[in-house]
């Protein structure tokens, strides 16, 4: 239960307080007692509930006609059962008992009244009253956690605007009504209360730039809504009518929780009592009301697929028809970036992210724009973003950023368990170097902190750097599969590769051609890339490499060997001993459902069809999966990236509500 | 053939900044590796920055490691050289050059660690 | 200092032949391939003459050849012509924090 005021009471004079219906009001009959007196007995009102302990042990007992023992052993506390109808209808008499004198009276009137901020605290998406029921000041997680949710409301529901709903001081319509959280203050109190008490509604300073709140005007068009705390305003003054009234606040966040904002954000009410204009206002009460700002959440290959992004460049039609077809088959949305707009960007997967957050009433997709800042910089604002599409971004928007910055290095795995701790979301993972040097890469540490301040998917680094463009999806891939941990980590290989053409060379195929039908291309036998000691060097380095991370993954997420594919790849090194793939990189693939689309690997085809997409094949569709193979070679993998680079995919947020896990 | 040149070089105080620009013409910048090689008045030559083809990875010479940053803009067809904290020893003429990332090689043919295309050059004098 | 050493001048008759060393350490020249040669005439912009040890751009003369031993490359130049007399510079890739190193430098003037 709440906690109340000390009130102390005195025989001089009669005592007027306030109790709010829901707390503990302790009496100080004590301090103000006549000097003789060794007794009491209290008499109350109906309406109020007197407890007397004497402890210690506390021994309880409700009144009657009894006399205690005064002294400061005996805790006496009130509650009220109902609001006063009129300012001090509830009376409480106290008897004081000396041996040598007449008793003395002290008298308390109290008024009752109902004053609760009331939220979405049980998570069902309703605002229900929770008067003295739980304790709203603090936020917990797990299926029997409590504590109200807000959305950062970072979409745009004004199409004419550039700018998101929440970096304005408006609620535009119903709509944007929607992205916020309803919080509920529900007042009772005698008709002229109000007079000789106000109610303000404030937020810590520290947190006043993280929250806007909104007052709305019942039965009134949400146009009548108006900005009562945010940036600006740390608290607020309310004009509230007495009687039984009830006020509504729509909340929203302003920002992510980030490594200096750990996502809560305490909205309270306090009652003060203005009645003495010759001192300070005192307050009586206050309530709060605690809420956890939603954290973005990415989605990995195993969510169902609901849109596809890509861009028109010079001469990627067949591309964009094959990515086209999967699109359908899947039974997904296709969007295109036009060439006009792209400004020949076209690797989609590194612009952006597409994760989505989540309040109990409401979901809303949210686009994580990399601070890379190419050709399509102004894609995820301009196109993606609006209407339910939320948008956020983090890192320099101006230099000082590096290839691991991009998002083709940042996944997510499907959900995992590890050493028995839950990942119901699953955990990011990013590539980083494997030790700090001069010259090494790291993602931009804005970027790790608010991937980790989410908290809900705790990140994993891999070591990605031994790659040119130092992707992690150059290396690995997550795809569904119907059993044990309902999906299969691809992993690229190049002993797997290896092993391949060493037996097509066994069977006598040795003669047979990489790269068969490239124009300009110089075709490789599989014999002379066999015999080519310096490509193997490089390939055993590349292993050892994929390995450090093969072990990570085990480790981080979980999993045994029998959870892993590999799938057959060469890499060379290039400038720098940096790592490029030798021919189209087969794990950068999209995986739409059950259907994949493969970068295109013109391997030496053997028998009428190349060994390469055999292999994977055989590897994959007896997973249930549908694999097409992708000609991206001269739009795309000459330019160092493949499938998965230059797409981007929207999918459906998970059925597992984030705050019924526990971090 | 890719052919280079620079600009943007001058007249700088110690501490000052400069941008200096190498714009490509006759084929497309986004297939070369780029460097900066810088050469002081009556000196040698000194190799300052490199970035890749891809423009996923940069790397430096101790000498302006953290004080200088190359980038580039493919879409523009230029590499950029970005100098802050300028001293008396920067003062040299600054070449950019290029080499031709070709992928048909089978493995690295070292084209990141030679310069075959140079461009004119353009100064950096800083003094007070 | 240059990381790389090379001898400050060479000279030659027309028609002769003149070596250039380059010596290095085996965190450079000895251990990588990848040593080039450049040619600078007095306010020109350097020419590159041979990269990867030995391997000739194409329409530079045959006279001009690399090799290496050890930590130690080699330009030589056969014939030697007027035209030849410039400055010529070796570099190589280092696995030290700078990765490109450039030798001193070496004046070759055809007597």
């Known amino acids: 239960m709440a906690q109340g005021t000390l009130i102390r009471v005195t025989p001089e004079q009669p005592t007027h307080a306030v109790c709010v219906l829901g707390t503990l009001t302790q009496l100080d009959i004590c301090s103000s007692a006549p000097e003789d007196c060794t007794s009491f007995s209290i008499n109350a009102s109906p309406g109020v509930v007197v407890d007397i302990a004497h402890g210690p042990p506390a021994k309880k007992k409700s009144t009657g006609s009894s006399t205690w023992p005064l002294d400061p052993g005996v805790e006496v506390t009130l509650t009220m059962k109902v609001a006063s109808g009129s300012t001090g209808d509830q009376k409480v008499q106290i008897s004081y008992y000396g041996p040598k004198t007449p008793p003395v009276k002290a008298l308390l009137y109290l008024t009752g009244v109902e004053i609760s901020l009331c939220a979405d605290i049980t998570r069902t998406g309703k605002v229900k009253p929770t008067r003295a029921v739980k304790d709203q000041r603090t936020w917990t997680w797990g299926p029997c956690g409590q504590g109200a949710i807000l959305l950062v409301n970072c979409d745009r529901d004004n199409l004419e605007s550039s700018a998101m709903d929440c970096e304005d001081d408006e609620v535009l319509d119903s709509e944007d009504l929607q992205d916020m959280s309803l919080m509920t203050l529900s007042t009772k109190t005698p008709k002229d209360f109000f007079t000789n008490h106000t109610l303000v509604l404030h937020v810590a300073r520290s947190e006043m730039d993280k929250v806007r709140v909104f007052q709305a005007t019942r039965g009134k068009l949400s146009s009548k809504c108006s900005v009562v705390l945010g940036p600006k305003w740390p608290s607020h003054y309310l004009m509230v009518p007495g009687g039984k009234h009830n006020m509504d606040f729509y909340v929203e966040a302003l920002a992510f929780p980030d490594t200096d904002f750990p996502g809560l954000i305490t909205l309270t009410i306090s009652l003060l009592d203005t009645s003495n204009l010759e001192l300070p206002e005192a307050v009586v009460f206050q309530d709060s009301v605690v809420f956890r700002v939603a954290p973005w959440i990415m989605t990995p290959n195993t969510q169902p697929p609901q849109e596809v992004y890509a861009c028109s460049i010079f001469e990627n039609e067949d591309f964009l028809k094959s990515v086209t077809t999967l699109a359908m088959k899947a039974k997904c949305k296709l969007t295109i970036c036009p060439e006009e707009e792209n400004m020949d960007d076209q690797w989609m997967q590194d612009e952006m992210e597409i994760g989505y957050i989540q309040a109990p009433h409401k979901t809303l997709p949210v686009v994580f724009d990399s601070p890379r800042n190419r050709g399509l910089k102004e894609f995820p604002i301009k196109r993606v973003m609006g209407p339910d599409f939320g948008y956020v971004t983090r890192g320099p928007q101006t230099g000082g950023i590096s290839g691991l910055d991009s998002f083709g290095n940042l996944e997510v795995s499907p959900p995992v368990t590890v050493r028995g701790k839950e990942y119901p979301l699953g955990r990011i993972l990013f590539g980083d170097s494997c030790y700090p040097s001069n010259d090494s890469r790291q993602m931009h540490q804005a970027l790790q902190d608010f991937l980790s301040a989410q908290q809900v998917q705790a990140p994993v680094k891999l070591y990605s750097d031994w790659l040119s463009v130092g992707h992690v999806d150059e290396f690995l891939s997550f795809v569904p599969a119907p059993d044990r941990k309902g999906f299969r980590l691809l992993l690229a290989s190049p002993r797997s590769c290896y092993k391949l053409f060493q037996e097509q060379q066994n069977e006598g195929h040795g003669e047979a051609l990489l790269f068969e039908g490239i124009k300009k291309k110089k075709q490789q036998k599989i014999k002379n890339i066999l015999s080519n000691k310096t490509l193997r060097e490089h390939n055993s380095f590349v292993e050892r490499c994929i390995d450090w991370n093969r072990e990570l993954l085990k480790r981080e997420l979980g999993l045994a060997e029998s959870d892993i594919i590999d799938i057959p790849q060469l890499f060379k090194l290039k400038e720098f001993s940096k790592a490029e793939a030798f021919f189209p990189n087969m794990v950068n693939m999209l995986v739409l459902g059950k259907h994949l689309g493969i970068p295109k690997p013109f391997g030496p085809v053997i028998n009428g069809r190349c060994c390469l997409e055999e292999k994977v094949c055989s590897l994959l569709e007896p997973l249930g999966l549908q694999c097409t193979f992708i000609n991206d070679f001269f739009t795309y993998h000459i330019r160092h990236g493949e499938v998965h680079c230059g797409t981007n995919v929207r999918r459906k947020p998970f059925s597992f509500k984030w705050w019924n896990m526990v971090p | 053939q890719v052919q280079l040149v620079e600009s943007g070089g001058g007249l700088v105080k110690p501490g000052g900044s400069l941008r200096l620009s190498c714009a490509a013409s006759g084929s497309t910048l986004s297939d070369y590796f780029v460097s900066w090689i810088r050469q002081a008045p009556g000196k040698g030559l000194e190799w300052v920055s490199f970035i890749n083809a891809a423009n996923t990875f940069t790397y430096y010479a101790d000498s302006v490691r953290g004080r200088f940053t190359i980038s580039r803009d493919n879409a523009k067809n230029s590499v950029y050289l970005q100098m802050n904290s300028l001293r008396a020893e920067d003062t040299a003429v600054y070449y950019c050059?290029?080499?031709?990332?070709?992928?048909?090689?089978?493995?690295?043919?070292?084209?990141?660690?030679?310069?075959?295309?140079w461009g004119r050059g353009t100064l950096v004098t800083v003094s007070s | 200092q240059s990381a790389l050493t090379q001898p400050r001048s060479v000279s030659g008759s027309p028609g002769q032949s003149v070596t250039i060393s380059c010596t290095g350490t085996?965190?450079?020249?000895?251990?990588?391939?990848?040593v080039s040669w450049y040619q600078q005439h007095p306010g020109k912009a350097p020419k590159l003459i041979i990269y990867n040890v030995y391997e000739r751009p194409s329409g530079v003369p045959d006279r001009f050849s690399g090799s290496k031993s050890g930590n130690t490359a080699s330009l030589t130049i056969s014939g030697l012509q007027a035209e030849d007399e410039a400055d010529y510079y070796c570099?190589?890739?280092?696995?030290?924090?700078?990765?490109?190193?450039f030798g001193g430098g070496t004046k070759l003037t055809v007597l």
């Open positions: 570099s190589s890739h280092s696995r030290s924090s700078t990765p490109v190193l």
């Open positions: 085996s965190g450079d020249v000895g251990r990588y391939s990848h």
């Open positions: 050059s290029s080499a031709n990332d070709d992928v048909d090689d089978i493995v690295a043919p070292g084209r990141g660690y030679y310069m075959d295309v």
